[in-house]
Interface confidence: low
């Protein structure tokens, strides 16, 4: 039985050219996290974090994506095309798969309202 829940940063916005952290947190379960996949709105994989073997950033994104903090993902040098949905998929044992959604809006404006907790200056 899957008892856990995924908490995410929800809907966030950030400045074009800036950086933002995508963060998901799995709570209310004792399941072991074996792998976390980060996917973009078109379902292409950005990065994978495997519990045993560490991080892999997919080649197409290696210049603009940095692993962490924690199981999160840092997007850098944001462009307007980065606007859209992002998904974290937690593969766990024995629960199975948990999935969280984040919506990122990249703004042209120099004023981007979002939680400072997840912003990198």
């Amino acid at each position: 039985m899957m008892t856990g829940t995924i908490e995410t940063t929800g809907n966030i916005s950030a400045k074009k050219g800036g950086s933002v952290i995508l963060q998901c947190h799995l709570s209310s379960t004792m399941a072991q996290v074996t792998q976390v996949n980060w996917e973009q709105h078109d379902h292409s994989l950005l990065a994978i974090r495997n519990a045993e073997l560490g991080w892999h950033i997919y080649p197409a994104f290696k210049d603009r994506v940095a692993p962490g903090p924690g199981l999160g993902l840092t997007l850098q040098s944001l462009t307007m095309n980065d606007t859209g949905e992002y998904f974290c998929t937690y593969h766990t044992y024995p629960d199975g798969t948990y999935r969280g959604r984040i919506f990122l809006e990249v703004l042209e404006s120099s004023v981007a309202e979002h939680s400072a907790r997840f912003q990198i200056p």
Partner: antibody
């Protein structure tokens, strides 16, 4: 250019063990992971397991746990797979394959080592 | 484990023809699919990863498409060197599994 050099055919007796090598060249050995793949009788491919040459961390297909053991020697840029308690079911071609990340997809392959288990 | 089902198991085609090979995953793998070509007695060679990204040096007559559970590899204007076996493989999460293969033969 990237090269993964494997030995020629091996003939071993049932119940014995064999250790197959895979010598890497043309890239930084510790920057990529090494996978092993089985192909039986010209049929499809089965992933056996993967090892991170930097840390020695390994990960196995459940089917091959206890059958295969993966190791590396960083000093010689060589990966090894030991297969034990051999039976005729283990007769196959075994490939080493460089893994982009820890085995996601395999961008360079060794030429394969044909293992025949027969008395 | 994710099961990859490839079809057809074999097909015959002539040089210049266009062929399509399909691969179905038993669960959603998004775009995490690779295609390999293998010639008789040789090792497999990576053609496509992330469902549609061609490996460097692979001719543009090859194209991959699909996402989720349904994928295909299309070869336009078949050349003599294209004949051999083709395998799909998911790269979504361990254990990584392959399709049963498609043998492409000259008609």
């Amino acid at each position: 250019q990237v090269q993964l050099q494997q030995p020629g055919p091996e003939l071993v007796k049932p119940g014995a063990s064999v250790k197959i090598s895979c010598k890497a060249s043309g890239y930084s050995f510790t920057d990529y992971n090494m996978n092993w793949v089985k192909q039986s009788n010209g049929k499809s491919l089965e992933w056996i397991g993967v090892i991170n040459p930097n840390s020695g961390t390994d990960n196995y297909n459940q089917k091959f746990k206890g059958k295969a053991t993966l190791t590396v020697d960083q000093s010689s840029s060589t990966a090894y797979m030991q297969l034990n308690s051999l039976t005729s079911e283990d007769s196959a071609v075994y490939f080493c394959a460089r893994g982009v990340y820890f085995g996601n997809y395999f961008d360079s392959w060794g030429q394969g080592t044909t293992l025949t288990v027969s008395s | 484990d994710i099961v990859m089902t490839q079809s057809p198991a074999s097909l015959s085609a002539s040089v210049g023809e266009t062929v399509t090979i399909t691969c179905r995953a038993s669960e959603n793998i998004y775009s995490s699919l690779a295609w390999y070509q293998q010639k008789q007695g040789k090792s497999p060679q990576l053609l496509v990863f992330n469902a549609k990204t061609l490996t460097e040096g692979v001719p543009s007559r090859f194209s991959g498409s699909g996402s989720g559970t349904q994928f295909s590899l299309k070869i336009n204007s078949l050349q003599p060197e294209d004949f051999g076996s083709y395998y799909c493989q998911h790269h979504y999460g361990a254990p990584w599994t392959f399709g049963g293969g498609t043998k492409l033969e000259i008609k």
